[in-house]
């Protein structure tokens, strides 16, 4: 009669994260009597993972009933497996002994490797903004996947980038790993519709890779260009200025209006109008009494945008021209929200 | 103190039905396994049947398999052996045995390779 | 089948050998059960090759290597005059049993 072998027939099982890991292991005698155990790794530290003498193991379920007497097949299955799960799983048996049962011989183990998907990949931005031509870096980062292998791309607008670097962690043996690049991007005035992807493919996910985005709206600036215009006289003594604010973005703008130096009012962009690549445009307009005035009047167009140092226009009014007429104190009317009348 | 003790013996004819019955004490029942080995006058020791802890895994000697029933009752503490058709052959005395091994799951099967303790034994003698 | 000598004698204080032999190495327990007369209770005297029960004289050991086993009494005496039946399974035979040795001390 020969001894007893433990015959584990497979050296490798892949199993998917959540679903049910089979371990299969028989024994080829009914002796000597004593309990199978089955551990994961070797020597002192192993784990046990089911002891069919005694125990609570809630994940592992048994492959044949091992009530039956001739039973040698000592199969487990282990549910919910997760990248944790992973490592060599060995089938031990052990005969009856006093007053401990005695470690009798162990299968050659089964190695279980577990598939985990990416997490979502997560791609973040600078945490402030950038105006056209500068480079910007993006990071994206997923977690949680196994085995190591995985492909990263970066796209803009569905332009892949090059310009990138990626790393995935840790570099020796792990139960799972986690990818982080980064990638450089160069900002154009035409950016505010723009998407920085970032790809991530894997054999879990049975080539529909996962995708995290970033709208460059929330990191581009797109500072203003100013224009200041001098309207034609739309009544007798009246002319209309202008100040053109044009491609900017975001939204956030405060304009103000200086006669000679001095601040004669101040709003905020409110009523704007969008252009197609997403920058706005925005005028304001000053109706100018010029028979208030003896002297030329220099008009400035003042704009914070963003929060960033101001920039402005001046627009120089000539008023020589212009009759004036004597002892008029008359005050000008106020026509409209953008109009300002200048004594 | 673990003691075994059996009952049911005597003169029996053959063709009958025997039935023997070993009460156990000091000790569970249910987690050893329990067998019968019978010697025959000038013989050596003779396995006859026998019973795992989990109670349903059972085994039989050649001598005796198709009419020997052993079974058990652990609220009894008791573990009978039912033989039909009783021969001549059968004529010796019945020990009742229990293992060593505390066994508390099923593949213990029904084992009786360490025997730790013997009951006295119940004579049984076929003749007609 | 085990095999085992018929018979063995010994002058007390002599140490006594009983070998069991399994005709494979798959008897992987023995137990060693004294027999003072035909028909009255055996008593395990060495079970798990080596493990003495309580009650049991130091004197009575036993050891197993491959597919044999040896009972040994050290320093015999005259009340361990008895028949020595060696006990073990294989996959088939939950219970096996040796013909049994009968020890004689001179």
């Known amino acids: 009669e020969e001894e007893l072998q433990v015959i584990q027939p497979d050296k490798s099982v892949l199993v998917a994260a959540g679903e049910t890991a089979t371990l299969r292991c028989t024994a080829t005698s009914l002796i000597p009597v004593g309990p199978i155990q089955w551990f994961r790794g070797a020597g002192p530290g192993r784990e046990l993972i089911y002891n069919q003498k005694e125990g609570h193991f809630p994940r592992v379920t048994t492959v044949s009933d091992l009530t039956k007497r001739n039973n040698m097949d000592f199969s487990i299955r282990i549910g919910n497996i997760t990248p944790a799960d992973a490592g060599t799983y060995y089938c031990v048996k052990f005969r009856k002994g006093s007053p401990d049962d005695v470690e009798f011989k162990s299968g050659a183990g089964t190695e279980l490797s577990v598939r985990a998907k990416p997490s979502a990949p997560v791609v973040s931005g600078p945490a402030a903004r950038a105006t056209p031509q500068h480079t910007v870096s993006f990071t994206c980062e997923s977690h949680g996947f196994s085995p190591r292998d995985i492909t990263l791309k970066w796209f803009k607008n569905g332009n892949e980038l090059s310009d990138f670097q990626t790393n995935v962690d840790p570099v020796g043996e792990s139960v799972s790993y986690s990818i982080h690049s980064t990638a450089k991007v160069v900002l154009t005035r035409e950016d505010v519709h723009s998407q920085v992807i970032c790809e991530v493919a894997h054999v879990t996910l049975q080539g529909d890779p996962l995708r995290g985005t970033a709208n460059l709206s929330e990191t581009i600036r797109v500072p203003p260009t100013l224009e200041v215009t001098q309207q034609p006289v739309r009544a007798e003594n009246q002319v209309n200025v202008t100040c053109q604010v044009r491609k900017f973005y975001p939204q956030r703008l405060q304009l103000t209006w200086l006669e000679n130096g001095n601040v004669s009012r101040t709003e905020t962009a409110s009523t704007v109008t969008e252009n197609k690549d997403g920058t706005y445009n925005w005028m304001s307009w000053l109706l100018v009494n010029v028979s208030a005035h003896r002297d030329d009047v220099k008009l400035t167009c003042q704009v914070e945008h963003d929060g960033q140092p101001a920039v402005s226009k001046s627009h120089d009014l000539k008023v020589s021209a212009h009759p004036k007429e004597q002892g008029s104190n008359t005050a000008a009317e106020n026509t409209g929200s953008n109009e300002r009348n200048i004594y | 103190a673990v003691t075994l003790d059996e009952s049911g013996g005597g003169l029996q004819t053959p063709g009958r039905a025997l039935s023997l019955v070993c009460r156990g004490s000091g000790f569970s029942i249910s987690s050893y396994n329990m067998g019968w080995v019978r010697q025959a006058p000038g013989k050596g020791l003779e396995f006859i049947a026998s019973i795992g802890s989990d109670g349903s895994s059972t085994h039989y000697a050649p001598a005796v398999k198709g009419r020997a029933t052993i079974t058990r009752d652990v609220g009894q503490s008791t573990v009978r052996l039912q033989l039909n058709n009783l021969r001549a052959e059968d004529t010796g005395t019945y020990f009742c045995?229990?293992?060593?091994?505390?066994?508390?799951?099923?593949?213990?099967?029904?084992?009786?390779?360490?025997?730790?303790?013997w009951g006295h034994g119940t004579e049984v003698i076929v003749s007609s | 089948a085990l095999t085992q000598p018929s018979s063995v004698s010994a002058n007390p204080g002599e140490t006594v050998k009983i070998t069991c032999s399994g005709d494979n190495s798959a008897h992987y327990y023995y137990g060693w059960y004294q027999q003072k007369s035909p028909g009255s209770a055996p008593v395990t005297v060495i079970?798990?090759?080596?493990k003495r029960p309580s009650g049991i004289p130091s004197r009575f050991s036993g050891s197993a290597s491959g597919s044999t086993a040896t009972l040994i009494i050290t320093g015999v005496q005259v009340e361990d005059e008895a028949v020595y039946f060696c006990g073990s399974a294989d996959s088939s035979n939950p219970a096996i049993f040796g013909a049994g040795t009968t020890l004689t001390v001179l």
């Open positions: 079970y798990y090759n080596d």
């Open positions: 045995a229990k293992d060593a091994y505390q066994c508390s799951y099923a593949t213990c099967n029904d084992y009786l390779d360490t025997i730790d303790a």
